[in-house]
């Protein structure tokens, strides 16, 4: 942009150098050149000479008018045609920007990833503003009334060392730019309720050579949280439909989960956990691929009526990927109950 230009005159913008996208804009150029009575004053936008909607106001001043200006940024400058000069003479230049006031930040979420030492808050910023927009995260203790504020662009990590005075907080986000300011809704946060257990990892899988082969998946986490609730989802690599098994886990030892699967098939497994009774899930673990062994006597395999599904799981649910290219985005289709109670109701955010 044109940040430091020696002007021989002035350039100004109405309604201002930063304005709402789609507004009508007038840009004025006033020359103060020595030894020049300009024949013409010219306007340039991004280096290209403008031809239309230019008005000569008086000997020294001209104006260009834009109807519904909708470019996020433009570099304007104006020149004078001085008698006896071969080249045009620069008068002045300005950066101009158009954009939108911010939307109120929405879907504010704060979590503490176990062992991170930070509370991470994220939010939806809404539609693009096209101009510099900052977010001020307010964290107010409900016990001491003290308020801390943090500047951010899209998310914030707040050291838990600075949250020592209290366990309960009110958090909200203020979006600010040159065209306006909006506040999110306030979020009540209890630090003990927002911890996400340390990442769960599937370490290995094996299929036994029994008459009815079973696959054992081994998985672990370094979490110190005692009561953890987990989901493992699995499907063949050719399938779009996931099955989901639920577990109460105790990570003082490696978890083993048994599955009766279709033989000679490549399966993908993923696991995620949350502190029991809390609402924040880990992201799904990295996909773990396992090939089941061949079976000599082939059978017709039906996962939903089959005796081969391990009965000790709490529930097995069926989930379908929206697109084969987006295996992380899942949509709940149905639930099949195996142990007398419905699926947990936490499936809407799978993926």
């Amino acid at each position: 942009g044109i940040t430091s230009i020696n002007c021989s005159g002035d350039m100004w913008v109405e309604p201002g150098e930063i304005f709402q996208m789609g507004m009508n804009v007038s840009i004025y150029c006033q020359e103060a050149l020595k030894h020049c009575r300009p024949r013409n004053l010219y306007f340039y936008k991004n280096g290209f000479k403008e031809e239309f909607d230019i008005t000569r106001i008086n000997r020294t001043t001209a104006r260009i008018w834009y109807k519904g200006f909708s470019e996020p940024h433009a570099y304007m400058h104006c020149t004078a045609e001085c008698p006896g000069h071969f080249q045009e003479t620069l008068i002045c230049g300005k950066d101009i920007s158009s954009g939108h006031p911010p939307d109120a930040p929405s879907n504010l979420t704060c979590v503490i990833y176990e062992y991170s030492g930070n509370m991470t808050c994220t939010w939806n910023t809404g539609k693009p503003t096209y101009i510099d927009t900052k977010y001020i995260v307010h964290v107010k203790s409900l016990e001491t009334e003290e308020e801390q504020q943090y500047l951010a662009s899209s998310y914030v990590k707040i050291s838990t060392d600075s949250l020592q005075g209290s366990r309960k907080y009110l958090v909200w986000v203020q979006a600010v730019n040159s065209l306006g300011m909006e506040n999110s809704q306030q979020l009540h946060v209890h630090l003990d309720d927002i911890v996400i257990p340390s990442a769960s990892i599937i370490s290995r899988a094996e299929t036994t050579n029994d008459t009815v082969p079973k696959t054992i998946v081994y998985w672990k986490s370094k979490t110190m949280i005692e009561k953890v609730f987990c989901e493992m989802r699995y499907k063949t690599t050719t399938n779009q439909t996931w099955s989901v098994k639920e577990f109460d886990a105790n990570f003082t030892y490696v978890q083993q989960s048994e599955f009766y699967l279709e033989p000679d098939s490549k399966y993908v497994f993923q696991v995620r956990c949350q502190e029991t009774g809390k609402r924040n899930w880990q992201p799904w673990s990295s996909p773990f691929v396992h090939q089941t062994s061949q079976e000599t006597g082939k059978r017709n395999w039906q996962p939903w009526s089959s005796p081969f599904v391990h009965q000790t799981s709490q529930t097995v649910s069926q989930v379908t990927a929206k697109s084969s290219h987006e295996p992380q985005k899942m949509e709940m289709l149905s639930a099949t109950i195996f142990r007398g109670h419905p699926a947990s109701g936490n499936h809407q955010d799978i993926g």
Epitope: E147, Q148, Q149, Y150, Q174
Partner: nanobody, 116 residues
Framework: QVQLQESGGGSVQAGGSLRLSCAAS????????MRWVRQAPGKGLEWVSG???????IYADSVKGRFTISKDNAKNTLYLQLNSLKTEDTAMYYC??????????GSQGTQVTVSS
Amino acid sequence: QVQLQESGGGSVQAGGSLRLSCAASGFTFRLTAMRWVRQAPGKGLEWVSGIDSRGSTIYADSVKGRFTISKDNAKNTLYLQLNSLKTEDTAMYYCAQGVYGDTYSGSQGTQVTVSS
């Protein structure tokens, strides 16, 4: 209780520089976001700049690229470096708690006068 005391103002020619200070006491300065606001003669209060506890900064468009806000937690002091001053920067300058807002809590302020 919270005490804020501004200093460093003065008279300067257009294009000149000044450094304003704000000495703070009565609260945990290192954990507190701060801001500068100003009031030009006959006008309302105008927010100028803010800084959070980690040093992230934000500026009004009118001062962006010319003013720099900073804080020294060891000295419990907030600063505002004013460069390339313009006549329209003439105002009483106040510091306050919080990153953003066009209010202050009754501190005395420091006068900046820029002449052409």
